[in-house]
């Protein structure tokens, strides 16, 4: 993978081990936990990242320590099953044979069941709403400046095509970023909105997944944007099937 050639590291994923044993003797970076080779020129899938986070040795030097307030979804962290492309398998089970269905971002979308539970397809999360509250500032941020800065961030840091950032809303101190990406819109090579949202979430928590980069330093016209709370809402192309309907955050 060309991004990793020079010194055999993975710029986009610090939860990897890289070695010059790939095709042609080139650098190859494998995700901790799964051992799957990852493309270091783009974001790694959320499934492989979660698997690395759960499976990696506690004393590993490249590990990012999970925040005690980590909020991935209402069920918290789990060790997922990923398919051969690194995506979440539609059905996830724990070691006590409790199973549930997930969406494309790995969030549970059904009640929990047993091994007989069927999840016919991986349902795509096509709309992600990232709800942020920033720390008090002298005055409100200029909405258009904030909009431009967040769009730049998703484009440059997470390599998400600008068309997938549907909107940025702002009512001080709440910022909402809407990401939309239908199955038909996502072309080969496009970053998935779920992966971009996960990298952003980890950045906001001060747990950057990028190798050797400083943490996220968000500024709007030079003024630091410090986030004190994050909530992420996931909307699927097919509504979830809970016995008591709820919105998964």
């Amino acid at each position: 993978h060309t991004a990793a050639q020079d010194n055999c590291t993975c710029p986009t994923n610090k939860m990897t081990v890289c070695s010059p044993d790939g095709p042609g003797g080139r650098c190859q970076c494998r995700a901790l936990g799964s051992g799957m080779a990852v493309d270091c020129s783009t974001l790694t899938s959320k499934c492989l990242l979660l698997k690395a986070r759960m499976s990696a040795p506690k004393n590993a030097r490249t590990l990012v320590r999970p925040s005690e307030h980590a909020l991935v979804d209402n069920d918290g962290l789990y060790d997922p099953d990923c398919d051969p492309e690194g995506r979440f398998k539609a059905r996830q089970c724990n070691q006590t044979s409790v199973c549930w269905c997930v969406n494309s971002v790995g969030v549970r979308r059904t009640d929990k069941g047993d091994l007989s539970l069927r999840c016919d397809e991986l349902v795509r999360t096509h709309h992600i709403l990232i709800d942020l509250r920033h720390r008090p500032t002298a005055g409100a941020f200029n909405h258009s400046d904030l909009d431009a800065e967040l769009r730049r961030l998703f484009r440059e840091r997470y390599r998400l095509h600008p068309k997938f950032v549907a909107a940025v809303h702002y009512e001080q101190p709440t910022i909402q970023i809407e990401l939309r990406q239908n199955t038909s819109q996502k072309a080969a090579g496009d970053v998935d909105i779920g992966d971009a949202a996960y990298y952003f979430e980890r950045d906001i928590k001060g747990e950057s997944l990028f190798q050797g980069r400083g943490g996220l330093d968000l500024r709007v016209r030079g003024e630091p944007l410090q986030v004190e709370r994050t909530l992420i809402y996931y909307l699927d192309e097919i509504p979830p099937k809970f016995s008591m309907k709820r919105l998964t955050a």
Partner: antibody, heavy 114, light 107 residues
Framework: QVQLQQSGAELVRPGTSVKISCKAS????????LDWIKQRPGQGLEWIGN????????NYNEEFRGKATLTADTSSRTAFMQLSSLTSEDSAVYFC???????WGQGTLVTVSA | DILLTQSPAILSVSPGERVSFSCRAS??????IHWYQQRTNGSPRLLIK???ESISGIPSRFSGSGSGTDFSLTINSVESEDIGDYYC?????????FGSGTKLEIK
Amino acid sequence: QVQLQQSGAELVRPGTSVKISCKASGYTFTNYWLDWIKQRPGQGLEWIGNIFPGGDYTNYNEEFRGKATLTADTSSRTAFMQLSSLTSEDSAVYFCARSSYDYWGQGTLVTVSA
Amino acid sequence: DILLTQSPAILSVSPGERVSFSCRASQNIGTSIHWYQQRTNGSPRLLIKYSSESISGIPSRFSGSGSGTDFSLTINSVESEDIGDYYCQHSYTWPFTFGSGTKLEIK
């Protein structure tokens, strides 16, 4: 040139442990995964697990978790595999191999016998 | 775990013949397959890596092909020194399993 030199044959008692070694030379030891492979007499190859000496990362085939323990000493450029609670099923030749797959040790024969 | 199925278990050919070994993976593994030859009481020797990459020092009569789930190793003109066991191994995701092997015999 790249070489992987394994320790000599071992005759051990059931229920005991054995630790075999694989000394690397001719390449940067901390840059490559090192794999361990088992071969019982007249049988095929079984992947036990691997270790990345540059970060002390290890992975195990579930069938060998609890049986094999992989370690490495970067100062002596040597990888080790300890096999515990030995039974006759553990009698085999054990190979170490560099992760680019082109260099293998000569194998260490472990015989478990009372 | 990814299962690798090798067939047939035994191949018997005459010197000079062309022979192919098959290896089938239980899921798509791209080109992450490697082929080894093991002679009696010897260490495995890498013949081909990443499905089709040739290895320095390995005779040009050995070649590999395939991607996804179906792979093959071909010896285009078998020599008597080629007798031994042939194994495929994947390196797609841990654990890196091996196929059960194919024994090559010379008539």
